[in-house]
Interface confidence: low
């Protein structure tokens, strides 16, 4: 803690500028009065302080706000922001989208610090939801924070916000997130035409059930072998061979690589060889012919 | 932003052997086929065959499979292609390619080979 | 091989309909030929435009559209404009490789 001393003649603070980079830390804490330093933080940024001169302001800040900094101090933070702790964050009430902004692009480049973790908590939390203006700022600050939400979290996300999120935004997400977000992603997307809505809803798929697989076979989409590697193992296992066939196009050919590996070699196993020799493709384990395909949870009871 | 990178020109002589790189950066690496793409003096395009980053599987157009080799190296998110046996039939512009008409192309290697 | 056949060169007016056409010497083009366009600028500058037949690229303006009209693959730009003076190729998937066409010289005067 800085202490209290009094101003020296002449040195009291008028307003927020450079002179103060030669003030010493006492000097800064007896002569800049902190309401003043509260109307003019957006000077703050373009004054080349040092980390210990913006510890002395940062102190005078929290003197003048115990309760927490209001939203117009906030805005203006800039770097003055990475002096704050999870706890100073928790004290405010952030709404604005301009605010969250400002202090996001604070941290650009760096990982998601634990403030910036508050910050976004606090904020998505005041909203109530993660509504697409909101999820188009963090996704472009942050890509992988769709998928560092838990499913329960991901189902507060309404449907119309999933046109903010990008294939990459998804790179992260495993299967349990997929399969809240698809239906969410099929939902938003219902209106447009095949080939419109195979391209958003591609990176979803990793959450389709086996029925839109099928549908999809039918809309000459040309899903590549990445993509299909992705999808439910138990949404791929019914599809036949000829509706992979339909569903892969060009990249069909790309099974030959895959045939050791899910959902593949799952599948291959559940087709019937004579079927896996119309693709030309040399894929092997197939069910010998002659012989039935029994699944046995469908099976009549002895009477 | 989806961005492929490629190598510089290239001035080599006949009989020797090239490698082209392209850097890939704003998408997943593996999630992609890589295709590459030749552009001869007379500017029309053949297609040289394509890799599949994640299991490197490969399909080559028959015309170029003794001549073109494709490899990638997934650390670094970057394709590769061997050029083999050179003649002055292979100076042209050659182009690395995510998706052809889907997706986006690199901004072209020239290989001239002369003596 | 086979041969993959455009227009050599078309003329069009700023907003007017045009289209550029893509055919096959095996045959009519059908969806399983997976019609691929794509744009080239000068310097060498390359533009996806369309995937399977009628699957616009990502950030590619809606006036661009692909189709199958009759035996051929065709794109169509309505309300052209000066910028989309071009060189356009097309390319057609023939069950294990694909085959591009010799292009279109698109001017719009």
């Known amino acids: 803690e800085v202490e209290k001393t009094a101003c020296p003649s002449g040195k009291k603070a008028r307003e927020i500028d450079e002179s103060l980079i030669f003030y010493k830390k006492w000097e800064l804490e007896a002569c800049v009065d902190a309401a003043l330093l509260a109307t003019q933080m957006d000077r703050v940024n373009a004054i080349p302080f040092t980390y210990e001169q913006l510890d002395v302001l940062k102190h005078k800040l929290d003197e003048l706000y115990p309760q927490g900094y209001p939203e117009s101090v906030i805005q203006h933070l800039g770097y003055l922001f990475l002096k704050m702790s999870p706890e100073d964050i928790r004290k405010w009430n952030v709404t604005s989208l301009e605010t969250l902004k400002a202090l996001l692009e604070v941290n650009k480049g760096h990982e998601m610090s634990p403030q910036v973790a508050t910050l976004i908590d606090r904020f998505v939390k005041g909203r109530g939801q993660l509504d697409k203006d909101t999820l188009d700022t963090l996704t472009a600050f942050y890509p992988g924070y769709l998928c560092s939400l838990s499913p329960e979290e991901l189902s507060s996300v309404p449907p119309s916000s999933i046109w903010a999120v990008r294939p990459q935004d998804l790179d992260t997400c495993d299967p349990r997130q997929l399969d809240v977000l698809y239906p969410k992603a099929r939902l938003a997307f219902q209106n447009m035409n095949g080939s419109e809505y195979f391209v958003k809803i591609q990176s979803f798929l990793g959450g389709a059930p086996t029925e839109d697989l099928k549908a999809l076979s039918q809309q000459n989409v040309s899903m590549d072998l990445a993509t299909f590697m992705k999808l439910r193992t138990d949404a791929v296992l019914p599809l036949t061979v000829a509706e992979v066939q339909k569903l892969l196009g060009p990249h069909v050919e790309g099974l030959k690589a895959e045939e050791r590996h899910r959902p593949v070699r799952d599948w291959i196993l559940r087709q019937r060889q004579d079927d896996l020799d119309t693709l030309g493709l040399g894929l092997q384990g197939g069910i010998p012919n002659g012989y039935l395909v029994l699944d046995l949870s469908m099976q009549e009871a002895l009477s | 932003e989806v961005q492929l990178q490629q190598s510089g020109p290239e001035l080599v002589k006949p009989g020797t052997s090239v490698k082209i790189s392209c850097k890939a950066s704003?998408?997943?690496?593996?999630?992609?086929?890589m295709h590459w793409v030749k552009q001869g003096h007379v500017k029309s395009l053949e297609w040289i065959g394509r890799?599949?980053?994640?299991?490197?599987?490969?399909n080559y157009n028959q015309n170029f499979k003794d001549k073109a080799s494709l490899t990638v190296e997934k650390s670094s998110s970057t394709a590769y292609m061997g050029l083999h046996s050179l003649t002055s039939e292979d100076s042209a512009v050659y182009y690395c390619v995510r998706d052809l008409g889907g997706g986006y192309w690199g901004q072209g290697t020239t290989l001239t080979v002369s003596s | 091989q086979a041969v993959v056949t455009q227009e050599s060169a078309l003329t069009t007016s700023p907003g007017e309909t045009v289209t550029l056409t893509c055919r096959s010497s095996t045959g009519a083009v059908t969806t399983s030929n997976y019609a691929n366009w794509v744009q080239e600028k000068p310097d060498h500058l390359f533009t996806g435009l369309i995937a399977?037949?009628?699957n616009r690229a990502p950030g590619v303006p809606a006036r661009f559209s692909g189709s199958l009209i009759g035996d051929k693959a065709a794109l169509t730009i309505t309300g052209a404009q000066p910028e989309d003076e071009a060189m356009f190729f097309c390319a057609l998937w023939f069950g294990s490789h694909w085959v591009f066409g010799g292009g279109t010289k698109l001017t719009v005067l």
């Open positions: 704003g998408y997943p690496f593996t999630g992609h086929y």
């Open positions: 399977g037949t009628n």
């Open positions: 890799i599949n980053p994640y299991t490197g599987a490969i």
